[in-house]
Interface confidence: medium
């Protein structure tokens, strides 16, 4: 067990051009507060996934009113640390989200209105018991400077808070076989209470004789790495060939703890460690009131008169979740018709329409030929959301502006020779063939398969294609 501590040093405009306007003004005084969300591991997780390691909300900072004409300074911050208690071992690697919130006061609103100013996120490695780590993160034009550390709560010590320490029984040295508890010189490592053979790196215990595994490890002594890639079945016994062990169903499967609570198995069932503001067997009861500003992203908080009546957040468009913390993927509903590209801008949806379509949802099929001229006598043909020109003989291209080589497609059959002509093409047919494209054989007796040739043209003469 232990506590993750976050100290915000400053929040203000970052370096470089485009300094942000102050979030507060004489007409709209405001104050800041912060929210931190911690998740185990280094996985890339969506911002709205549960804060499995815990979350905390800071106190409100002092009320700040911008002086007219002054640039946005570092804004006054809440006093004290943000503390996120963790009950189990410290995972060593973690992801964080730190949100800066503005509480508006005064004449624009009749009570506080909350809006998210900046959100920074990162993934870090951190050993418990180490010194403060300093960090600078930027979100748009804002810059957040902060420090953080993880410390173990006695009697736990070590980089994962899994070793237990006890005060020395003798003033000079620890008992037989027991080491001093660095850096606590006056304490000794407690006698081994975990199950014999429990991995000191990957296992820990809170009760004598037990061996509980850190994330990524399994087996009775926490010596077997969990391999998701080589396990064929989602659940099953140990495989001697793959070295893969997937635990059987446990009471914490699927995490029965709501609202970001962390689950730990007990001999009979499970126990939830709830983040601040929640309680109950499954962290399902909220002790937070509207005064705590639980509704994010501009949600309207409606709460009962006593702490036991849960508040309700009425979320604005684009957000959902019990605290309006989840952004709705409104594009998943495929609102854009006719192949339009959907863009969720947060405050609104936009559809980028394909050629030939228009309207807020690309629902209007434009008259593709409206205002489209086909040159050189070509005619416009509508279809498929894009206009097409059917070009007059001798012209081609999208708008019939290109002069075509009429012989390029080899239109004269049976070895006839093609000649480009001002009005199109002329085929000079090989002996034995006739027709505009030399497509008709001439019968051996001299009769044609067609009616008699027009006057002045003998079979075998070049046939002009008019």
């Amino acid at each position: 067990a232990g506590v993750f501590e976050l100290q915000i040093h400053s929040f203000g405009p970052g370096p470089g051009p485009g300094a942000p306007r102050s979030p507060c003004s004489a007409r709209l005084p405001c104050r800041l507060f912060f929210r931190v969300c911690l998740k185990p591991g280094l996985s890339e997780e969506a911002a709205e996934s549960p804060c499995a390691l815990g979350a905390a909300l800071s106190a409100r900072g002092p009320v700040y009113t911008e002086q007219p004409g002054a640039p946005a300074p570092d804004l006054p911050l809440p006093d004290g640390l943000l503390q996120v208690p963790f009950r189990d071992a410290w995972p060593g690697t973690f992801s964080f989200i730190i949100e800066t919130w503005r509480e508006e006061l005064g004449d624009q609103i009749g009570g506080p209105a909350w809006s998210l100013l900046a959100r920074v996120a990162g993934r870090r490695r951190l050993a418990a018991g180490g010194p403060w780590a300093r960090d600078i993160q930027r979100a748009g034009a804002w810059e957040l400077r902060f420090s953080y550390r993880a410390r173990c709560e006695p009697p736990a010590v070590g980089t994962a808070c899994t070793r237990l320490c006890r005060p020395r029984s003798a003033p000079s040295r620890c008992g037989p076989g027991l080491r001093p508890c660095a850096p606590l010189e006056d304490e000794c490592e407690a006698p081994l209470v975990c199950r014999a053979g429990c991995s000191p790196e990957h296992g820990f215990c809170e009760q004598p004789g037990e061996c509980r595994c850190l994330e990524g490890w399994t087996g009775p002594l926490c010596t077997v790495p969990v391999s998701t890639s080589s396990c064929l079945s989602p659940r099953g016994p140990s495989s001697a060939t793959t070295g893969c062990l997937v635990p059987g169903p446990g009471p914490c499967d699927g995490n029965p703890c709501a609202n970001g609570g962390s689950c730990s198995e007990t001999p009979r069932s499970f126990e939830c460690t709830c983040p601040r503001g929640f309680y109950g067997l499954r962290c399902e009861v909220s002790g937070v009131t509207c005064a705590d500003g639980p509704c994010f992203n501009g949600g309207l908080c409606v709460g009962g008169a006593d702490p036991d009546s849960a508040y309700i957040c009425h979320c604005p468009p684009g957000f959902q979740g019990s605290n309006c913390e989840k952004r709705v993927d409104r594009c998943s509903l495929q609102p854009c018709r006719n192949g339009g590209l959907c863009l969720d801008l947060g405050h609104a949806l936009r559809c980028r329409c394909r050629a030939g379509f228009a309207g807020p949802r690309c629902e209007h099929d434009l008259d593709d030929c409206a205002g489209r001229a086909c040159a050189n006598g070509g005619t416009c043909v509508e279809g498929g959301g894009a206009h097409r020109c059917s070009c007059a003989l001798g012209f081609g291209g999208r708008d019939c502006r290109e002069r075509a080589d009429p012989c390029a497609a080899r239109p004269c059959a049976h070895g006839g020779r093609c000649y480009a002509h001002f009005s199109g093409l002329v085929c000079a047919c090989a002996p034995g063939y006739m027709g505009a494209r030399c497509e008709f054989p001439v019968h051996p007796d001299g009769a044609s398969a067609l009616p008699a040739a027009p006057p002045g043209l003998r079979p075998g003469d070049p046939q002009r294609y008019l």
């Epitope: 005064g106 609103i109 009749g110 009570g111 209105a113 309207l300 009425h314 979320c315 604005p316 468009p317």
Partner: antibody, heavy 121, light 106 residues
Framework: EVQLQQSGPELVKPGASMKISCKAS????????MNWVKQSHGKNLEWIGL????????TYNQKFKGKATLTVDKSSSTAYMELLSLTSEDSAVYYC??????????????WGAGTTVTVSS | DIQMTQSPSSLSASLGGKVTITCKAS??????IAWYQHKPGKGPRLLIH???TLEPGIPSRFSGSGSGRDYSFSISNLEPEDIATYYC????????FGGGTKLEIK
Amino acid sequence: EVQLQQSGPELVKPGASMKISCKASGYSFTGYTMNWVKQSHGKNLEWIGLINPYNGGTTYNQKFKGKATLTVDKSSSTAYMELLSLTSEDSAVYYCALGYYGNYRRYFDVWGAGTTVTVSS
Amino acid sequence: DIQMTQSPSSLSASLGGKVTITCKASQDIKKYIAWYQHKPGKGPRLLIHYTSTLEPGIPSRFSGSGSGRDYSFSISNLEPEDIATYYCLQYDILWTFGGGTKLEIK
């Protein structure tokens, strides 16, 4: 201009149910919660409940649970309040009201003109 | 639920004079109180929110003050168009109106 246009007066018999409408204009209907308020005996004002047009979520005053049902029709930007099993106690003027100016304000600054409901046999 | 006790229920004053209406909440409402003017056949009109902040376009003859559970609303230099019923509204937890004060001119 932000406006709330309410339906006309109603005379209904005891035991019947009825629905009042409130047509919104001049703003994004789904962006703001719509509230309903009852004024009885020409004086007392009571908040009945609210509906979030964006997702249909509702919050009711405990006193009006089972008496009022709030709905919306997003396509016409209209909010509705259905009053059930009417008695003479339900005779009143009913207002729709909106917290509009500012960021999801929690008091009401735009009101409809009211719908008078008279319950009488 | 929070109760709002408004007094007096009616009052009469002279043109040019000053009147004060009070509202007492059953618990601390953290200055989240608004004041409305209501005339027959119309919806209530917001005058003041957050205890003392005047809405745009409302004359400075109207004012509000208070904290904790006790709040007051005043109109000075009374004019004929001020004849109406006035209500307080708490919006700290849900919404509750006071019982109203009917203002008449002597």
